[in-house]
């Protein structure tokens, strides 16, 4: 029969490394008679033998951790008892070994030009991993402005555009490496005016091209002010290239100017914007106000929109309080007079009156009118409306038509320049070139002169019969 | 048919002055943009002025405050007035009807500017 | 002021052959839809004579051989058959804003 023997531990516990996830196992070897009751410890707590993620075996001389976790951590002790003398513990350490694994990863990040950008890299392991950072294809150096912090983020003072790019972070220790997805830094650049439109001094009725360039990330949009109200003509052409924008401002110059370009980029909810402004300004504009009695400007009326040329300039004489709207009230009056007139005579009428009430502009240092070419005005009087002008002048002769006479706008034909003597002294009306084309049968003409007076126009192809004897002077 | 006939030409000292006439017939003389334009023997064109159908005068950089520019309606004639003339003025003076384009031209008078 | 310029300065042609001539401004003369530009043509010992205003328009009486081609800055004279009595100096001239000015001319000869 076997003597009493108090228990004996023969191998003590060893700090065990384990990975996570992986199964680490303490043996406390225990010779003793009677046979031990040996009991498990962690941290001075007791395992309790029915926790699944624990398996006890050989009579409890086998602790094994099934699946190993970083909170596993600590120091695991046995105690073996049999009654026979006292309790004995050997105690060992668990320390949970971990591949590094990065818990917070670094963002997407937009940041503005100038500002601090931190890209965070937070990071578990055991050994404990050190960070590193890729941008593109290769190793992040660190300077002055850019470093890894000892979280592991990457913090760059003052951004600048060279920093745009991808980054990705690097966790290392001697189980193995972890990489964060790849991320962007965006590098946003507050607008900035590049080349600021020059100011000009000009003749009147000049075209004029304001160019400005800005550039910023994102690209920024160009928006041009006239003297502080949006640019209400002229047009504008714009093309990108490398994150800048090229704007260009073209102008009919009728009045001076102050013209502001306006550069404007979105960062966020807020905005930046820069300004650059330029003059412009007309050569002798004093004098020309003076000289011309009148200004040059695109017809905005709706009487004479379909009879003068798209987007002309015409004169509007500044005698009137308000010339656009007077000499639109004269036309409209003088269309309501037109009314009863012959098929023939209408649209070559309204051709007449509006190409003189609304006069082409010719360049030069003033803004001048160009009065219509005499033998057009004759054309409308002694072919288009020969019967209709003789009953007007017949009216005015017995004083019932004065008050009419004096609201219809007619040119009177001696008065102006012939294109026979200076084609480039008056303007010509297309209409008629093209109706006299198609005119086969002549209006009986009453007039007091012979109807071999009725002028030469351009074209030699007419189809009326015209005298070269007719004296154009 | 449109004539001009310029005169008033002649042999004249540097500093001495000169007064050159354009008589126009053929057409409503009023009515008509008016210019003078120089051609200095061998050399090309060169405007000197022109003066529209309100009497307002314009004038190139070399002539300006020496020549001035007139005309008489009634009279259909066109006026050049030439002061403090230099040897460089030395040229053949035309007439010419036109108002962006030199539509018709006369014979043209010569100047002589020599001491 | 505008400058204009010329080229060539002189071409020799033969009868038949076309004939171009260049003429460049310092800057657009196109205002109101019209390019303000005008060719002359001045024969030996005479005046000069217009051929073609507003860059393309032929003067009355002007043979259609003569023709004017450009917009805005660019403009060129075409012969398109040169004659003998063709034998002239050719000048542009802008009428789009005072002082007008004309080209040095481009002497056109007979080979």
């Known amino acids: 029969e076997k003597l009493p023997k108090a228990p004996v531990i023969t191998t003590p516990l060893e700090t065990v490394d384990a990975l996570v996830e992986e199964v680490a196992t303490f043996m406390c070897a225990v010779e003793s008679y009677p046979q031990p009751e040996i009991s498990w410890t962690r941290n001075k707590i007791l395992i309790k033998l029915f926790d699944t993620r624990y398996s006890i075996r050989e009579n409890g001389q086998l602790l094994t951790i099934l699946s190993v976790e970083d909170s596993d951590d600590g120091i695991y002790c046995c105690i073996a008892n049999n009654g026979v003398g006292g309790a004995v513990e050997s105690c060992g350490a668990l320390q949970v070994k971990m591949k590094p694994k990065i818990t917070r990863p670094p963002i997407n990040v937009k940041i503005i030009e100038g500002l601090k950008a931190v890209l965070p890299c937070t990071t578990m392991g055991n050994p404990k991993p050190s960070v590193s950072w890729i941008k593109g294809d290769n190793a992040l150096r660190e300077n002055s402005r850019i470093a890894v912090l000892e979280s592991g983020s990457l913090r760059i003072h003052n951004v600048q555009k060279e920093d745009a790019g991808q980054y990705r972070c690097v966790a290392k220790n001697s189980l193995g490496t972890a990489y964060s997805k790849l991320v962007k830094l965006e590098v946003e650049v507050f607008a900035r005016i590049l080349r600021a439109p020059e100011s000009h001094n000009v003749t009147f009725g000049s075209f004029v091209t304001l160019r400005c360039t800005a550039i910023g990330i994102p690209v920024p949009t160009i928006s041009w002010i006239e003297n502080g109200n949006a640019v209400s003509s002229g047009s504008i052409q714009e093309s990108v290239k490398d994150r800048v924008i090229d704007s260009r401002l073209q102008l009919f110059i009728t009045k001076p100017g102050l013209y502001t370009c306006i550069a404007t980029n979105k960062h966020g909810e807020k905005f930046s914007t820069a300004k650059a402004a330029a003059t412009v300004s007309i050569a002798e504009w004093s004098k020309s106000q003076k000289d011309s009695q009148g200004y040059c400007a695109q017809y905005r009326g709706e009487v004479c929109d379909a009879v003068l040329a798209k987007d002309a300039l015409v004169f509007f004489n500044t005698s009137y309080r308000d010339p656009e709207d007077a000499q639109e009230l004269l036309i409209h009056t003088a269309w309501n007079e037109l009314k009863a007139v012959s098929p023939l005579c209408r649209p070559a009428a309204e051709a007449l009156l509006c190409n003189h009430l609304f006069q082409e502009c010719s360049p030069g240092v003033v803004p001048t009118p160009m009065p219509i070419c005499r033998e057009y005005c004759l054309a409308v009087k002694e072919l288009f409306c020969a019967k209709e002008w003789q009953a007007m002048e017949g009216k005015a002769h017995r004083g019932l038509y004065r008050s009419g006479m004096h609201l219809l706008p007619v040119p009177e034909c001696s008065k102006l320049p012939s294109m026979h003597r200076d084609p480039t002294a008056c303007t010509r009306l297309p209409y008629l070139d093209y109706k006299k084309e198609n005119i086969t049968t002549f209006p009986s003409i009453t007039s007091s002169r012979p109807s071999a007076d009725i002028p030469n126009l351009p074209a030699s192809t007419s189809s009326f019969a015209v005298s070269p004897a007719y004296s154009m002077t | 048919e449109v004539q001009l006939v310029e005169s008033g030409g002649g042999l004249v000292q540097p500093g001495g002055s000169l007064s050159l006439s354009c008589v126009a017939s053929?057409?409503?003389?009023?009515?008509?943009?008016m210019n003078w334009v120089r051609q200095a023997p061998g050399k090309g064109l060169e405007w000197l002025s022109v003066?529209?159908?309100?009497?307002?005068?314009y004038y190139a950089d070399s002539v300006k405050g020496r020549f001035t520019i007139s005309r008489d309606n009634v009279k259909n004639t066109l006026y050049l007035q030439l002061n403090n003339l230099k040897p460089e003025d030395t040229a053949l003076y035309y007439c010419?009807?036109?108002?962006?384009?030199?539509?018709?031209w006369g014979q043209g008078t010569q100047v002589t500017v020599s001491s | 002021e505008i400058v204009l310029t010329q080229s060539p300065s002189s071409v020799t042609a033969s009868a038949g052959e076309k004939v171009t001539i260049n003429c460049k401004s310092s800057?657009?003369?196109?205002?109101?839809?019209?390019?303000?530009l005008a060719w002359y043509q001045q024969r030996p010992g005479q005046s000069p004579r217009l051929l073609i205003y507003?860059?393309?328009t032929r003067e009355s009486g002007v043979p259609d051989r003569f023709s004017g081609s450009g917009s805005t800055t660019d403009f060129t004279l075409t012969i398109s058959s040169f004659q003998p009595e063709d034998v002239a100096v050719y000048y542009c001239?802008?009428?789009?804003?005072?002082?007008?000015?004309f080209g040095s001319g481009t002497r056109l000869e007979i080979k």
């Open positions: 003066i529209d159908t309100h009497s307002i005068a």
């Open positions: 001239q802008q009428g789009y804003s005072v002082p007008y000015t």
């Open positions: 800057q657009s003369v196109l205002y109101n839809q019209k390019n303000y």
């Open positions: 010419v009807l036109g108002r962006t384009a030199l539509v018709r």
């Open positions: 053929g057409f409503t003389f009023s009515l008509y943009y």
């Open positions: 507003w860059a393309s």
